[in-house]
């Protein structure tokens, strides 16, 4: 049970945590204009990764898209890739991950092979969470230079006589939005990965085999259930006694003799 | 066709208090902002205060902040300027004004008179 | 805040004659996000309350006839009327639509020879 329940959150938490990292790609506000210096400007600025805003008291906002490729910065199309290859990799590990889940029986898809899938999917979406987290880094990063850039020259004097105030950005919603999604995503590739772990059969092929320990006779049939009842002190076989977790996952997918009372 | 009609305008005492009202018709009300200017032969135009048009943000100009409120009553396409501690330098005539496109007034009321004498 | 300065103060000229008049302003009014200029002009008539003739330095607003031109770009903006006729005879204000408080400039004023 707590394998497919490690397995069932694992996926949940990278599917919030893509979900929010596809938001965060789309969101317009990676960067928004600083008002510390001018609390109740007329005209506020914010930048996405695929274009620009300026939304105006008035209630009227105007959006541009960087409609130039090669005109970009190299930095923020750095960050676009990593954040399209954390959506790529999430997506494909979500798809993965469906067909892994426990509680989904397609075909008589074998446990390796599920936990194979589980490790891939786990995998997957840890390196879709650490590209997203690295892409809203970078952005962060390149905002705190240019903030720090735009601050040391803010007022640059015409004559001394005219003021000509310089935009600062400051870090946008979609930055938070991105880190907490990136962190859920790399959380549930983890607990996928756990998950994977508690699947494997390890050199165990689950065949009807019966095995004999000193002074007690300990059957097993496929599932992992005793057919007897005494646990002797069978060490050579522990790891068909670390199913103490996965029988109480097997109750939900085989019959168990409590079934036929 | 939009529509902007101030009321309430008058004689008033110094230190005495005073409500304008500006009726809208012919558009949205509750999709715009909306602005309280005031015009006098000296000073000119003078913008006087801004409600947002979910009655958030509201900005007011120093001169008349913490003595004057701006509402607004979105069903009745009504705005309010409530003016109190009057002085003799708040004389002037008022006019309420839509905002638009370019943070502009694009339509404006013919506006009410307040004079304030002893 | 931001001060609006306008000249001259008086304009005095002849029917069909081409105008200019200036606004000047403490502070840039561009705006780096779109490369707006947030300046706008209003044209009176006496009696009568503003009206919108201009708003982001040079997009006339609908009903404006063309003879009406704005220009310029961060502190120096212009408004020219191309031809004058009877009924431009007004003051002209300019007006900082960049941040609050909105500020207006003092006026030009339209005046027949």
């Known amino acids: 049970m707590a394998v497919t329940a490690c397995q069932g959150l694992g996926f949940v938490v990278s599917l919030i945590g893509i979900a929010g990292i596809i938001a965060a790609t789309c969101m317009d506000q990676w960067s928004t204009q600083d008002l510390y210096n001018n609390p109740v400007t007329a005209v506020f600025n914010y930048q996405g990764l695929w274009r620009s805003c300026v939304r105006e008291s008035s209630g009227f906002t105007e959006c541009r898209g960087y409609f130039t490729l090669l005109g970009l910065p190299a930095m923020l199309q750095a960050v676009r890739a990593l954040m399209i290859v954390g959506i790529v990799l999430g997506a494909i590990g979500l798809l993965v991950s469906i067909f892994a889940l426990k509680c989904i029986r397609i075909g008589s898809m074998e446990d390796s092979a599920k936990a194979n899938m589980t490790l891939t999917s786990g995998i997957m979406f840890i390196v879709s969470g650490l590209c997203a987290i690295a892409g809203v880094s970078v952005f962060a990063n390149m905002l705190v230079t240019n903030f720090w850039m735009s601050t040391a020259n803010m007022y640059t004097g015409m004559g001394g006589m005219v003021q000509t105030v310089q935009t600062r950005y400051t870090f946008g919603a979609a930055l938070f939005v991105g880190w907490v999604a990136g962190g859920l995503t790399l959380i549930g590739g983890v607990m996928m990965c756990i998950a994977c772990r508690g699947l494997a059969p390890e050199e165990t092929n689950y065949k009807a085999v019966s095995y004999h320990a000193s002074g007690h006779s300990v059957a097993y049939k496929p599932g992992g259930f005793k057919a007897s009842t005494g646990f002797g002190s069978n060490t050579k076989n522990k790891k068909i006694y670390d199913g103490g977790a996965r029988t109480e996952d097997e109750v939900q997918s085989y019959p168990s003799k409590h079934d036929y009372v | 066709d939009v529509q902007l009609v101030e009321s309430g305008g008058g004689l008033v005492q110094p230190g005495g208090s005073r409500k304008l009202s500006c009726a809208a018709s012919?558009?949205?009300?509750?999709?715009?902002?909306v602005h309280w200017i005031r015009q006098t032969p000296e000073k000119g135009l003078e913008w006087v205060a801004y409600i947002g048009s979910g009655s958030r943000p509201i900005y007011y100009a120093d001169t008349v902040k913490g003595r004057f409120t701006i509402s607004r009553d979105n069903p009745k396409n009504t705005l309010f300027l409530q003016m109190t501690s009057l002085r003799s330098e708040d004389t002037a005539m008022y006019f309420c004004?839509?905002?638009?496109?370019?943070?502009?007034?694009?339509?404006w009321g013919q506006g009410t008179l307040v004079t304030v004498s002893a | 805040d931001i001060v609006m300065t306008q000249s001259p103060s008086f304009l005095t000229v002849t029917a069909g004659e081409k105008v200019t008049m200036n606004c000047r302003s403490s502070?840039?009014?561009?705006?780096?996000?779109?490369?707006?200029?947030?300046l706008t002009w209003y044209q009176q008539r006496p009696g009568q309350p503003p009206k919108l003739l201009i708003y982001w330095a040079s997009t006339r607003e609908s009903g404006v006839p063309d003879r009406f031109t704005g220009s310029g770009s961060g502190t120096d903006f212009t408004l020219t009327i191309s031809s004058v006729q009877a009924e431009d005879l007004a003051l002209y204000y300019c007006q900082n639509a960049y941040s609050f408080p909105l500020t207006f400039g003092a006026g030009t004023k339209l005046e027949l020879k």
């Open positions: 004004a839509r905002f638009y496109y370019g943070n502009s007034f694009d339509h």
């Open positions: 502070q840039s009014l561009l705006n780096s996000g779109n490369q707006k200029n947030y």
């Open positions: 012919g558009f949205t009300f509750s999709g715009f902002g």
